[in-house]
């Protein structure tokens, strides 16, 4: 398969490289080793070398898997077999280098590797902060409410996504083919483990998007569909968040196994199969974007009225908008309509960098915005800290005879302010919980 300009796609290039290596192994198995001192035949991840007599220079044609093979088909690769019958360090691949874009493949590989380093840092940081945020929301009972239960599930989905991606990267074969400085050690990882990690990654990424959708739907319900209790809906949210991804991941696994069962399923050459996963994700991105626009409209009208008593309403609107972006994954909409097949070169790397950077650090941002700098959470932590210090100081003071230490009364009111949906006001009108909801989120 080639792209519009007749250039080999990375996926096909990898398959051709793999095929070249397999052919080499077969050839070497059927070749008789020479009787005298000689260097062993081998596939060195670049070219196929036959058994070579000691103290001579081996010569093989440029490997046919190279995308520019036509231009270098007359060229050779050289390698020196030492006097001791061992391959030396001396070699020369220069006749097989891309005559047009020398080093372009190395440059691409380098960009991809830098992106991988960036998202590894992002996901690792997200994983750490999300775990801490999850612990905080779990440990403080007074923070338990539907809103925070949804946050906790979103945090979990972000953590699973990060863990799955980082695990999958460890099991994937290195980038190939290896004309640059990244010549790999042979890939011996068990394919089953790698594919399992790939399936888990797709599920966790899917779950992450559906939980972003749940956040959007829940917020939309609170602000727009007023008068209904949210308590009963939480089960539906759970089912949507963790169940919906299975509805498209399982069909993808079946079709992939039957129609495109190649390597670790990391390359998507048959685009129709990839759309099984891509379509639902694009739909969630679109729905969340529409919800975001709707919420923004509500925000604008709220902030414009005196109800909010906010003179710096533009600043407040900007802050609220930026706060909602990571929670709803709105940034995804920027490049969502642009598929990887439609873009090439710099724009493709810009798309990759934008999506990968924001996706990997999104978990970190969400945990900071909706846990660490949340006023309710901060006041709970402060209160918990005060209680702890008080207990320690009371333990130090020995109680006198007949004197009991009365436990400090803890207010029963929840620190987690659920929006007062459906509260009847004296006027008999329904109280719209917009202010409280927006306070909690924005």
């Amino acid at each position: 398969e080639t792209d519009s300009e007749g250039q080999t796609t990375t996926g096909e290039l990898y398959q051709r490289w793999e095929h070249y290596g397999q052919e080499c192994q077969k050839m070497l198995e059927t070749t008789e080793p020479p009787s005298g001192l000689a260097c062993n035949g081998s596939f060195d991840m670049y070219a196929c070398w036959n058994y070579t007599a000691a103290n001579t220079t081996a010569r093989v044609s440029c490997p046919w898997y190279l995308p520019w093979f036509r231009q270098v088909s007359a060229g050779f690769v050289f390698r020196q077999c030492g006097s001791d019958g061992q391959w030396g360090s001396w070699r020369d691949h220069t006749q097989c280098e891309n005559p047009e874009k020398n080093g372009a493949f190395q440059d691409q590989t380098l960009i991809l590797e830098r992106l991988q380093i960036m998202y590894t840092v992002g996901y690792s940081l997200s994983l750490t902060t999300l775990l801490l945020a999850l612990l905080i929301l779990s440990l403080f009972r007074r923070l338990h409410c539907t809103r925070n239960y949804i946050h906790m599930n979103l945090f979990t989905s972000f953590m699973l996504r990060a863990a799955a991606i980082l695990t999958r990267d460890q099991l994937l074969p290195p980038l190939g083919p290896y004309t640059g400085d990244q010549a790999p050690t042979p890939w011996n990882q068990a394919l089953a483990a790698c594919r399992t990690a790939q399936i888990m990654t797709q599920y966790c990424v899917g779950a992450n998007y559906t939980w972003l959708l749940v956040e959007g739907v829940y917020l939309h319900h609170l602000l727009v569909i007023v008068g209904r209790s949210e308590k009963g809906h939480f089960r539906c949210y759970l089912l949507l968040g963790w169940g919906a991804p299975a509805l498209f991941v399982i069909p993808w696994v079946i079709v992939r196994y039957l129609r495109e069962n190649t390597q670790c399923w990391e390359r998507n050459e048959v685009k129709a199969i990839w759309w099984i996963i891509r379509t639902p994700i694009l739909i969630t991105i679109l729905i969340n974007f529409l919800i975001f626009i709707r919420i923004l409209g509500i925000l604008v009208s709220k902030l414009r009225t005196r109800q909010m008593r906010c003179p710096d309403y533009r600043l407040r609107l900007a802050r609220s908008t930026l706060t909602l972006v990571p929670l709803l994954g709105v940034h995804e909409v920027v490049f969502a309509p642009v598929t990887e097949e439609q873009v090439e070169g710099s724009l493709r790397f810009a798309k990759l960098a934008f999506e990968i950077f924001l996706s990997s650090f999104q978990g970190f941002l969400v945990s900071v915005l909706y846990c660490f700098i949340n006023k309710e959470v901060q006041s709970e932590i402060r209160q918990g800290w005060r209680h702890r210090r008080l207990r320690l100081s009371l333990q130090e003071q020995r109680p006198r005879p007949h004197q009991e230490l009365a436990p400090r009364a803890v207010p029963l009111s929840s620190a987690c302010r659920e929006a007062a949906v459906g509260n009847a006001l004296p006027s008999g009108m329904l109280h719209v919980p917009g202010d409280e909801v927006l306070e909690s989120y924005c």
Epitope: Y46, T57, Q80, R91, D92, P174, T179, D181, Q182, A183
Partner: antibody, heavy 119, light 113 residues
Framework: QVQLQQPGAELVKPGASVKLSCRAS????????MHWVKQRPRQGLEWIGE????????NYNEKFKTKATLTVDKSSSTAYMQLSSLTSEDSAVYYC????????????WGQGTLVAVSA | DVVMTQTPLSLPVSLGDQASISCRSS???????????LHWYLQKPGQSPKLLIY???NRFSGVPDRFSGSGSGTDFTLKISRVEAADLGVYFC??????????FGGGTKLEIK
């Protein structure tokens, strides 16, 4: 990018030994031979030897066969060169170097370690 | 072992002038594959050597086109068309045709006149 990191200097007494290190990063350590080169003050460059990190096999310049021993630690992507029975003649800057992938010319060099042999 | 001899030992030049460094090998550097493995390196003061030219005349990536290499067999030349301050340092020729060992020339110091 490819980087070869070496410590700045080593001060040793005559007759003693010294083990120089060269930590590699930015590429697959085991897929490229590591070379060592000596440079005495205001003099040319001398090739000491090379080592294949994937199997530890090495080749030496006859002149340095009894002087230098090359080893690698794959887990830390580090190449080592031990110099024994040091004399003032061994006072020099020692570089680790690596070919450009698939070639036989040195495209990547460490910063060099100055070995000063002095009583 | 192949002996590499460089001349001159020191080359004083004025900025903007052309400089020419010669390198001679004790035996032909034409490999059995037909290629000639003669390379040039520049070592600036306090730095490690840097590759300039490989296989007689091929500039390494990032090397300005002021640098050019020529020659065949046993006689080779490095030319710098318009010398700049950044070009000052010691130039070494090196061969990797008959190896091991890889051998280097004694060096030519390019300095301001």
């Amino acid at each position: 990018q490819v980087q070869l990191q070496q410590p700045g200097a080593e001060l040793v007494k005559p007759g003693a030994s010294v083990k120089l290190s060269c930590r590699a990063s930015g590429y697959t350590f085991t897929s490229n031979w590591m070379h060592w080169v000596k440079q005495r003050p205001r003099q040319g460059l001398e090739w000491i030897g090379e080592i294949n990190p994937s199997n530890g096999r090495s080749n030496y310049n006859e002149k340095f066969k009894t002087k230098a021993t090359l080893t690698v630690d794959k887990s830390s992507s580090t190449a080592y060169m031990q110099l024994s029975s040091l004399t003032s003649e061994d006072s020099a800057v020692y570089y680790c170097a690596r070919f450009y992938y698939g070639t036989s010319w040195f495209a990547y060099w460490g910063q060099g370690t100055l070995v000063a042999v002095s009583a | 072992d192949v002996v590499m001899t460089q001349t001159p030992l020191s080359l004083p030049v004025s900025l903007g002038d052309q400089a020419s460094i010669s390198c001679r090998s004790s035996q032909s550097l034409v490999h059995s594959n037909g290629d000639t493995y003669l390379h040039w390196y520049l070592q600036k003061p306090g730095q490690s050597p840097k590759l300039l030219i490989y296989k007689v005349s091929n500039r390494f990536s990032g090397v300005p086109d002021r640098f050019s290499g020529s020659g065949s067999g046993t006689d080779f030349t490095l030319k710098i068309s318009r010398v700049e301050a950044a070009d000052l340092g010691v130039y070494f020729c090196s061969q990797s045709t008959h190896v091991p060992p890889f051998t280097f020339g004694g060096g030519t110091k390019l300095e301001i006149k």
